[in-house]
């Protein structure tokens, strides 16, 4: 059913979404310090806009006695609750930011009459793509996937001079809610990635994983996985492995690489961390100062998506266009607007688009280095360090499968 | 000592590429953050690319998605690729090294400085 908008006559209002499942354990306090931050930004730059209207933020939680797993497995019908609570109430906002879960935000999306744009930190699956007036800002699975298929294709760089077509996948179902549809996307047979492969197999049980380490009868030699080196550990522990064995380890949301006393640990050697490029300014900011590395990424995409808004907001209003509008809740993409810390870029489909890094762990030094970037908006790889210190034989990447002949290679002449 | 040549500036018209590339002696590069820097007739030196020493590479937004960096250690060489040149591009082009403090920042000041290389963008 239509619900009246708080949103006209000078006087706009936010819906946040505070839901018990959510993609991130963290605690509903900091979202609260992380919307309040932005909220005060965005305050500013209409004033010196000479905007001279009300913004505010109506915190709307969810009722935990029904939803308290914390757990987006069990999200579907939270995000469809707290709608209806809206209605009930008669308050809903010119937006809504929230849920993450990817479960709730398409069941939302499916199930309401969506004339309002929604901002979600997460939504990362496949089933969230497309969506006219969704917008999401932190990395949905489709840009993973289009890193991982222009890496398997790269081989013109002076370290990797083999295309690749296969791979392994490990996913054993405890991953946490960015990596569950990260390799729910990388498994999908329907999906880019497996499109693009010749070969791909999941492995779901520790012992798979461990047994291929060693196998000389593999189909490949590059295993995805998704969390932090911890899980890794846990999986791999001191394992010994195959020479030409190559790990990517997907940790996108993890600023712990970056932290200058940082000493690689000898079970990443093999590894290949794909990361995201690190902020400038969010270790002294006043809302993150609370926030783990892991948890930064989360807290800043709330923080962001007010920012967003005040921008939309700023530009309608300076156009004298009215802000209840279709029109309204479809300008949320294909924009760059001034984020917390710098420039946010929303692609076509309104999902954020940033810098991957792929690091690698120098075998002389023991610390991560960068060996590439790829720049989401452009699916495009840039080579970092053109003579990386390896483990890998004469500092190359292996072939993806052993002993294949030179078909494969690139040569330069 | 210390030393950094630059090299491969030239005149290219709109829209073309150059790369330059910065021959370091005297340091590696694992321990220094490398910067590239323009200046144009009349105007103050801007800083347009830094490589933290980790790797890390950080773009001033007038040239982010244009121009990237990178670094041969076996080589002792920086290099400065610029693609979709324009006319406002036109400077000269000094590499810069500074120990590093950071192994992911980019320096506030740098230490030592080469002696440029011309870059012209005209039809």
């Known amino acids: 059913s239509q619900v009246s908008q708080n949103c006209h006559n000078g006087s706009y209002e936010i819906s946040v979404l505070m839901m018990g499942n959510s993609a991130f354990a963290e605690p509903l306090k900091n979202l609260e310090d992380a919307v309040n931050e932005g909220l005060e930004i965005v305050r500013g730059r209409l004033q010196n806009a000479g905007l001279n209207v009300t913004v505010n933020a109506t915190f709307m939680y969810s009722d935990g006695l029904i939803h308290n797993s914390g757990d987006c497995r069990s999200s579907t019908c939270e995000g469809l609750d707290l709608l209806r609570k809206i209605s009930n109430a008669q308050r809903m906002g010119c937006v809504l930011i929230g849920p993450s879960c990817t479960y709730s935000t398409f069941q939302m999306y499916l199930d309401t009459e969506l004339s309002y744009p929604m901002i979600s930190a997460g939504s990362f699956g496949l089933s969230c793509d497309y969506k006219e007036t969704l917008t999401r800002l932190m990395s949905p699975a489709r840009k993973l996937m289009y890193f991982l298929v222009n890496f398997w294709k790269t081989n013109d760089l002076p370290f990797k001079t083999y295309s690749w077509s296969t791979s392994y996948v490990y996913k054993n179902g405890t991953e946490t809610e960015d990596c569950f549809w990260y390799l729910n996307a990388l498994e999908a047979s329907v999906s880019y990635f497996s499109h693009e492969l010749g070969f791909k197999v999941v492995l779901r049980q520790d012992k798979e994983f461990q047994d291929i380490l060693m196998d000389h009868n593999r189909k490949s030699n590059v295993i995805i996985m998704c969390g932090g080196p911890e899980f890794l550990y846990k999986l791999k522990g001191d394992r010994a492995v195959a020479e030409d064995i190559v790990i990517i380890l997907v940790d996108l949301f993890n600023d712990q690489y970056f932290e200058d006393n940082v000493t690689a640990p000898d079970y990443m050697k093999n590894v290949l961390v794909l990361t995201l490029s690190p902020g400038n300014s969010l270790l002294n900011s006043s809302f993150s100062r609370n926030l783990s590395p892991t948890k930064r990424d989360f807290a800043l995409a709330y923080l962001n998506g007010i920012l967003l808004f005040g921008h939309m907001l700023k530009i309608f209003l300076e156009n004298g266009e009215n802000i209840t509008t279709p029109k309204f809740a479809h300008a949320f993409r294909n924009l760059t607007f001034e984020g917390y810390d710098g420039p946010v870029t929303l692609d076509d489909w309104g999902d954020v688009d940033s810098t991957m890094v792929l690091l690698y762990t120098s075998v002389d030094t023991k610390k991560y280095k960068v060996l590439l970037t790829y720049d989401t908006h452009v699916n495009k790889t840039y080579p970092v360090d053109m003579s990386p210190t390896f483990t890998w034989k004469n500092s190359k990447l292996p072939n993806d499968i052993t002993g294949r002949g030179p078909q494969h290679h690139h040569h330069h002449h | 000592q210390l030393q950094l040549v630059e090299s491969g500036g030239g005149l290219v018209q709109p829209g073309g590429s150059l790369r330059l590339s910065c021959v370091t002696s005297?340091?590696?590069?694992?321990?220094?953050?490398i910067g590239w820097f323009r200046q144009a007739p009349g105007k103050e030196r801007e800083g347009v690319i830094c490589?933290?020493?980790?790797?890390?590479?950080k773009y001033a937004d007038s040239v982010k998605g244009r121009f990237t960096i990178s670094r041969d250690n076996a080589k002792n060489t920086v290099y400065l690729r610029m693609d979709s040149l324009k006319p406002d591009d036109t400077a000269v082009y000094y590499c810069?090294?500074?120990?590093?403090?950071?192994?992911?920042?980019?320096?506030?000041?740098?230490?030592?400085w080469g002696q440029g290389t011309q870059v012209t963008v005209s039809s």
């Open positions: 005297g340091f590696t590069l694992d321990d220094y953050a």
């Open positions: 810069a090294a500074s120990g590093a403090t950071s192994r992911w920042n980019c320096p506030p000041q740098y230490d030592h």
């Open positions: 490589l933290t020493s980790g790797g890390l590479p």
